[in-house]
């Protein structure tokens, strides 16, 4: 596991404890909460980040209408169970034995049940729609410049391969970033779109997960891009299973 050798820290995850007790005395960083060793050369999985957080304190000019199956994370924070690779376990339960199934980004995709609830597989979230509203500016941003800046951000800051940023839509003041990544497209070593979206969400909220880096300073042609509202929609490879009662509520 790589980490900055000189002072043994994890550049990509401040929610770690690092010590020179890895193989050969190399720096090894463990995520708070889980104690799992993390690879500091890339993003840490959202599951481990949530666990750490709980332990510490189409048409270019048209906005996308989220699918009827799109999920929004309304449940907020919880202390998740992560598998040995740091991914969300398909079934999550709380202290009172209430259980539910989640997708690969940890968002609930079924009604809540008891310990008998079965979640056969971890369903992959293959499409993420990040919906932003920016603060008023003198004029609209140039769409091409905005597109280029956001793609650069995801490539350089979050190490997400450019092919997974499907589109950037803009109708002032709303910006939409579409991330797409099918199971078959994701190769070993590729950053997961769910992890990139989570790092971006925390950056936008001024809660950067990066060690020692300044907060996110988004600029388009020198003009600050200040976000005042964020909504993230998650679309799974298999539609979620909620009862009709919830769908009509």
């Amino acid at each position: 596991h790589t980490a900055a050798q000189d002072n043994c820290t994890c550049p990509t995850n401040k929610m770690t404890v690092c010590s020179p007790d890895g193989p050969g005395g190399r720096c090894q960083c463990r995520a708070l909460g889980s104690g799992m060793a993390v690879d500091c050369s890339t993003l840490t999985s959202k599951c481990l980040l949530l666990k750490a957080r709980m332990s510490a304190p189409k048409n270019a000019r048209t906005l996308v209408r989220p699918s009827e199956h799109a999920l929004v994370d309304n449940d907020g924070l919880y202390d998740p169970d992560c598998d040995p690779e740091g991914r969300f376990k398909a079934r999550q339960c709380n202290q009172t034995s209430v259980c539910w199934c989640v997708n690969s980004v940890g968002v609930r995709r079924t009604d809540k049940g008891d310990l008998s609830l079965r979640c056969d597989e971890l369903v992959r979230t293959h499409h993420i729609l990040i919906d932003l509203r920016h603060r008023p500016t003198a004029g609209a941003f140039n769409h091409s410049d905005l597109d280029a800046e956001l793609r650069r951000l995801f490539r350089e800051r979050y190490r997400l391969h450019p092919k997974f940023v499907a589109a950037v839509h803009y109708e002032q003041p709303t910006i939409q970033i579409e991330l797409r990544q099918n199971t078959s497209q994701k190769a070993a070593g590729d950053v997961d779109i769910g992890d990139a979206a989570y790092y971006f969400e925390r950056d936008i909220k001024g809660e950067s997960l990066f060690q020692g880096r300044g907060g996110l300073d988004l600029r388009v042609r020198g003009e600050p891009l200040q976000v005042e509202r964020t909504l993230i929609y998650y679309l799974d490879e298999i539609p979620p299973k909620f009862s009709m009662k919830r769908l009509t509520a």
């Epitope: 404890v17 104690g35 040995p84």
Partner: antibody, heavy 117, light 107 residues
Framework: EVQLVQSGAEVKKPGASVKVSCKAS????????INWVRQAPGQGLEWMGN????????NYNQKFKDRVTMTRDTSTSTVYMELSSLRSEDTAVYYC??????????WGQGTLVTVSS | EIVLTQSPATLSLSPGERATLSCRAS??????IAWYQQKPGQAPRLLIE???ESISGIPARFSGSGSGTDFTLTISSLEPEDFAVYYC?????????FGGGTKVEIK
């Protein structure tokens, strides 16, 4: 030479607390985790938790979470493990251990804590 | 938590024989396993780390193998001082856990 020297044996009454110390020498105290492991008579090893002396970050085994407190004093390179609300089943040898790589490479000599009325 | 199951509980062998001890994890832990030897009245002694990496000062007759969920400690030829209890321990995630131990006794 790396050494972990623990405090002496203790006899306590049920409901009392015990505080065991572990003094480290021969390495950079703040750079390595210190773990606490206990072993009841004739039983196996049980991990209680650990502390990272550099910043006092602690992590406890859920089983002991409400009763155990681990602290450190960097000026004396000493780590402490306090266990409260003692019961007879807490009778055991308590070891401190310095964590290296994937294993607990260095161990204290052990401290026998006997809980008896 | 990750449960480690060691087998057999007791292994009766003669000096010079080969000892094979098994440790099975309840879930994939890669190679995050260590092996210890413990003699009566003594603290455990680290023998192997990262499933197969030997520790300096430990005799070459001790070797480890395995990854994922199945791990093995092998003592190629038992010496009289090797009769003891052996524990595996995982450090994949907290809480760190130990196996129940395998006692290697003289036949």
């Amino acid at each position: 030479e790396v050494q972990l020297v623990q405090s002496g044996a203790e006899v306590k009454k049920p409901g009392a607390s015990v505080k065991v110390s572990c003094k480290a020498s021969g390495y950079t105290f703040t750079s390595y985790w210190i773990n606490w492991v206990r072993q009841a008579p004739g039983q196996g090893l049980e991990w209680m938790g650990n502390i990272y002396p550099s910043n006092s970050y602690t992590n406890y085994n859920q089983k002991f979470k409400d009763r155990v407190t681990m602290t450190r004093d960097t000026s004396t390179s000493t780590v402490y493990m306090e266990l409260s609300s003692l019961r007879s089943e807490d009778t055991a040898v308590y070891y401190c251990s310095s964590y290296r790589s994937d294993g607990f490479a260095y161990w204290g000599q052990g401290t026998l804590v006997t809980v008896s009325s | 938590e990750i449960v480690l199951t060691q087998s057999p509980a007791t292994l009766s062998l003669s000096p010079g024989e080969r000892a094979t001890l098994s440790c099975r994890a309840s879930q994939n832990i890669g190679t995050s396993i260590a092996w210890y030897q413990q003699k009566p009245g003594q603290a455990p002694r680290l023998l192997i780390e990262f499933a197969s990496e030997s520790i300096s000062g430990i005799p070459a007759r001790f070797s480890g193998s395995g990854s994922g969920t199945d791990f093995t400690l092998t003592i190629s030829s038992l010496e009289p001082e090797d009769f003891a209890v052996y524990y595996c321990q995982q450090s994949n995630s907290w809480p760190f856990t130990f196996g129940g131990g395998t006692k290697v006794e003289i036949k």
